[in-house]
Interface confidence: medium
């Protein structure tokens, strides 16, 4: 008995060939001997089967002795043994229809689980193997689960169902809803304007929800909500914003926030959350702000940074074009009785300068100038 695998919703063509290369009488029946279709001369006739409106044949092939049964919009319950009766012969074809669906929506939040469920006909014992867009293979039976979806899991998942040494392939497009970056850090000199950007790693027709940026300033004992906003069909509107600092927000995607001035009291870390309509859970992006200040008070030249710096970052004070006078893995460095000239305060990581602030030290009889 020939075995043919089909996919739910697809079209399958079951072949039946006569030894004579001409149009002769044929019938297709199911295992209950109910006629599906056949011919009456050059006319296609249909029987009382459940397939009535979905069954067809190719009249153009009859003259060549080929009498296919075409079943459109396959259903799992179409799985059956189909019998072609032609020239006093019976050809049997076993059709097995499978369906593979994602547990819920195919748009899932980062960190959520994806469950793929195989629909299969009774009596079948298929195995399933799926390959993610990043090449990760998972195997299973009726259900396959992937926990903690990552951004790289976005794309086409290719799943192969194996039954009776035959294969059928499914492709499922999965969109992982996430920000492009889980975390970002912005380095600014005191007084500079700060731009925070939160690009999304996906595109959808309509995007509706709400978001909030909670901020934990390094100097503050508790976090506070800096801004709450609404997202409606990719249009952003501010619902509520704290008075200090008075953030501004772009009206279009990507989500964009502007802090008018970087000040030591704002240095710290924030968590932007985005709740999307009809989705449980939220998208998160962490953002960090490091602020630098260089000052001269009497005979003391000081450079300080505030905010979440890693212990391996180096803070240095140097006179332009000279070796660093002081260099420490600390958040404040100073030089007593600095020479006159342009001093540079540098925050660096493995030799790469992340932030630089210049301060001009005048001869002792005048006051310092900060460019």
């Amino acid at each position: 008995k020939k075995v043919v695998l089909g996919k739910k919703g697809d079209t399958v063509e079951l072949t039946c060939t006569a030894s004579q290369k001409k149009s002769i009488q044929f019938h297709w029946k199911n295992s209950n001997q109910i006629k599906i279709l056949g011919n009456q001369g050059s006319f296609l006739t249909k029987g009382p089967s459940k397939l009535n409106d979905r069954a067809d044949s190719r009249r153009s092939l009859w003259d060549q002795g080929n009498f296919p049964l075409i079943i459109k919009n396959l259903k799992i319950e179409d799985s059956d043994t189909y019998i072609c009766e032609v020239e006093d012969q019976k050809e049997e074809v076993q059709l097995l229809v499978f369906g593979l669906t994602a547990n819920s929506d195919t748009h899932l939040l980062q960190g959520q689980s994806l469950t793929l469920t195989l629909e299969s006909p009774p009596g079948s014992s298929p195995s399933v193997q799926c390959r993610s867009p990043r090449g990760k293979n998972i195997q299973g039976g009726k259900t396959l689960s992937v926990s903690q979806l990552e951004l790289q899991d976005s794309g086409t998942w290719t799943c192969t169902v194996l039954q009776n040494q035959k294969k059928v392939e499914f492709k499922i497009d999965i969109v992982v809803l996430a920000f492009q970056k889980a975390s970002s850090i912005v380095y600014k000199k005191e007084g500079e304007q700060v731009e925070f950007s939160f690009p999304l790693a996906f595109t959808v027709e309509k995007l509706t929800g709400s978001g909030e940026l909670w901020w934990q300033a390094e100097r503050a004992s508790s976090s506070k909500s800096w801004i709450t906003f609404d997202l409606k069909n990719k249009e952003v509107s501010v619902k509520r914003v704290t008075q200090d600092p008075k953030l501004q927000m772009g009206k279009k995607l990507p989500l964009h926030l502007t802090l008018p001035q970087a000040l030591p009291q704002y240095a710290g870390s924030g968590n932007l959350t985005l709740a999307l309509e009809a989705k449980t859970g939220k998208l998160h992006q962490e953002v960090n702000l490091v602020v630098m200040r260089a000052t001269q008070l009497q005979k003391n030249l000081t450079c300080e940074v505030w905010g979440p710096t890693s212990p391996k970052l180096m803070l240095s004070l140097k006179l332009e074009n000279k070796e660093a006078k002081v260099s420490k893995r600390e958040k404040a460095v100073w030089v007593l009785n600095p020479e006159a000239g342009m001093w540079q305060c540098l925050l660096s990581d493995s030799g790469q300068v992340l932030l630089e602030s210049n301060i001009k030290v005048l001869p002792t009889w005048s006051t310092p100038v900060q460019p």
Partner: antibody
Framework: EVQLVESGGGLVQPGGSLRLSCAAS????????MSWVRQAPGKGLEWVAN????????YYVDSVKGRFTISRDNAKNSLFLQMNSLRAEDTAVYFC????????????WGQGALVTVSS | DIQMTQSPSSVSASVGDRVTITCRAS??????LAWYQQKPGKAPKFLIS???SLQSGVPSRFSGSGSGTDFTLTISSLQPEDFATYYC?????????FGQGTKVEFK
């Protein structure tokens, strides 16, 4: 555990004044907007006023504007509602509530304080 | 001000029934809608925000849907502790406004 406890309710004559207090605990009070909501006997809920985290933004329902004042003391984790020129229609149970989450819902409520305005 | 209209004003039901309460806003409020449950002599209890986000600890038999002007609260299988009054509330613009309430009572 978030707790909100109202006090200061009682019987007052029309035209009189009353000050309600709400003591908050179990969360960082200075990080949240707070609201007052009232419920007249046998009636539904009516939002009265709210105040932002540091107390410099305040909003009121039209029926109490100019008569009621919402305020807060973050150092004492306390919310207040000063009610002047009270009318019979102000008779209600007054609830203090925290506005939490990005959908600005009233996620925690006090048990309420009854204010009766009657001569 | 945005008017919130709930229907029905009361519903008689039995344990195990599916109960649906609707709330209509006089103008579009996106998803800025919350649902609360209140029992006699008690403070309201927060159930749902953002029209459909269930507050943690609230049983999954409660669900919310809708956006714009039309919203629904559904209790899939009514339990004895669910007999109460339910209110919707908009947080789209000041003043916040509540629906008049829907009382779910024993049939």
């Amino acid at each position: 555990e978030v707790q909100l406890v109202e006090s200061g309710g009682g019987l007052v004559q029309p035209g009189g004044s009353l000050r309600l207090s709400c003591a908050a605990s179990g969360f960082t009070f200075s990080s949240y907007w707070m609201s007052w909501v009232r419920q007249a006997p046998g009636k539904g809920l009516e939002w009265v006023a709210n105040i932002n985290e540091d107390g410099n933004e305040k909003y009121y329902v039209d029926s109490v504007k100019g008569r009621f004042t919402i305020s807060r003391d973050n150092a004492k984790n306390s919310l207040f509602l000063q009610m002047n020129s009270l009318r019979a229609e102000d008779t209600a149970v007054y609830f203090c509530a925290r506005e939490g989450g990005q959908w600005l819902a009233l996620d925690h409520w006090g048990q309420g304080a009854l204010v009766t305005v009657s001569s | 001000d945005i008017q919130m209209t709930q229907s029905p004003s009361s519903v008689s039901a039995s344990v195990g029934d599916r109960v649906t309460i609707t709330c209509r806003a006089s103008q579009g409020i996106s998803s800025w809608l919350a649902w609360y449950q209140q029992k006699p002599g008690k403070a309201p209890k927060f159930l749902i925000s953002g029209a459909s986000s269930l507050q943690s600890g609230v049983p999954s038999r409660f669900s919310g849907s809708g956006s714009g002007t039309d919203f629904t609260l559904t209790i899939s299988s009514l339990q004895p502790e669910d007999f109460a009054t339910y209110y919707c509330q908009q947080a789209n613009s000041f003043p916040w406004t509540f629906g008049q309430g829907t009382k779910v009572e024993f049939k």
